[in-house]
């Protein structure tokens, strides 16, 4: 069962999924000059049984002013409803995420592919968040969200995750300060711009989390 | 052009209230988090309230919870912040803030004045 909604955006922090559960769907996107190719899958999928899962289609694409050369990329089709979008990832990731049962690990980036990604996520994805260069985090319990089917329908939990004031980046446990992105420039001179790449797996939140200020509520 | 601006500041008297109001346009509007910070003169600003996108989560600092409250109309491309209770220290300028993680955006309106005094 597809999630019906993004995972929710809490200002100033980003979020990526560590693994993802069997069903989950990413929309095959090429880079700006490049066009999927008219026999390419729509999207890869997470595929597979209890003891191995992995992406099934691959995408393809082919240069816009050429006709028959193609490459393996990620394309882009024509803009759709924005969903789940996620900053390009690195393929580097934490070795107990291939052994979660049922689960795929990111995909390996191709050669011009797209700078974001495209996921349908499915019940019982969760995503972990992490605040953004130059904002610290206030915790009040685990800064992710799981996707849950509650009478007939999908939510998203609550992230307990407050990023504020412009000091410290948060990070997850062992985790190296993220650089700066190189791709293109923020949108407001006010923007942080930082990639979300080699989050690692968060069990349980560290024992000196601080003491939120703040407060939650579901509206 | 990406657009927020800030209406319904003004002075009020203590105990009085406000509701401040955030119009959005040039972005998809619902797939911003929303949120409100204060600055106060000689002070950082600070975040007061937010709203995740669907569905709709709130969050606010301790010193406003019970008093204000934060929503959104999607349909109006306008976030609120219903300010009850006020008390001079809510003496601030109030900035409404529009984020999304990926792609990128990071909006900030040019605030509205609030001043509670008698």
């Known amino acids: 069962e597809l999630c019906d909604d993004d995972p929710p955006e809490i200002p100033h922090a980003t979020f990526k999924a560590m693994a993802y559960k069997e069903g989950t769907m990413l929309n095959c996107e090429c880079k700006r000059g490049f066009r999927r190719i008219k026999s390419g899958s729509l999207y890869m999928l997470c595929t597979g049984n209890s003891s191995h899962s992995s992406w099934d289609n691959q995408c393809q694409c082919t240069s816009s002013a050429t006709r028959n050369t193609t490459k393996q990329v990620t394309p882009q089709p024509e803009e759709q409803k924005e969903r789940k979008t996620t900053e390009m990832q690195s393929p580097m990731q934490p070795v107990d995420q291939a052994s979660l049962p049922g689960h795929c690990r990111e995909p390996p980036p191709w050669e011009n592919e797209a700078t974001e990604r495209i996921y349908h996520f499915v019940v019982g994805q969760m995503v972990y968040y992490q605040c953004v260069q130059g904002y610290r985090a206030l915790h009040r319990g685990p800064a992710e969200s799981v996707c849950k089917m509650t009478h007939g329908k999908t939510r998203w939990t609550q992230p307990q995750l407050i990023c504020t004031g412009e000091m410290e980046t948060s990070q997850f446990p062992g985790e190296e300060k993220p650089q700066a992105s190189p791709e293109g420039r923020p949108e407001s001179e006010t923007s942080c711009l930082v990639t979300t790449t080699d989050f690692q797996i968060q069990t349980e939140m560290a024992a000196t989390m601080e003491t939120s200020i703040f407060t939650t509520e579901y509206q | 052009d990406v657009q927020l601006v800030e209406s319904g500041g003004g002075l009020v008297q203590p105990g009085g209230s406000l509701r401040l109001s955030c119009a959005a346009s040039?972005?998809?509007?619902?797939?911003?988090?929303m949120s409100w910070y204060r600055q106060a003169p000689g002070k950082e600003r600070e975040l007061v309230a937010y709203?995740?996108?669907?569905?709709?989560?709130?969050t606010y600092t301790d010193s406003v919870k019970g008093r204000f409250t934060i929503s959104r109309d999607n349909a109006k491309n306008t976030v609120y912040l219903q300010m009850n209770s006020l008390k001079p220290d809510d003496t601030a300028v109030y900035y409404c803030?529009?984020?999304?993680?990926?792609?990128?955006?990071?909006?900030w309106g040019q605030g509205t004045q609030v001043t509670v005094s008698s």
């Open positions: 709203i995740t996108t669907s569905p709709g989560y709130t």
């Open positions: 803030n529009a984020w999304r993680g990926a792609p990128r955006g990071d909006y």
């Open positions: 040039g972005f998809t509007f619902s797939s911003y988090a």
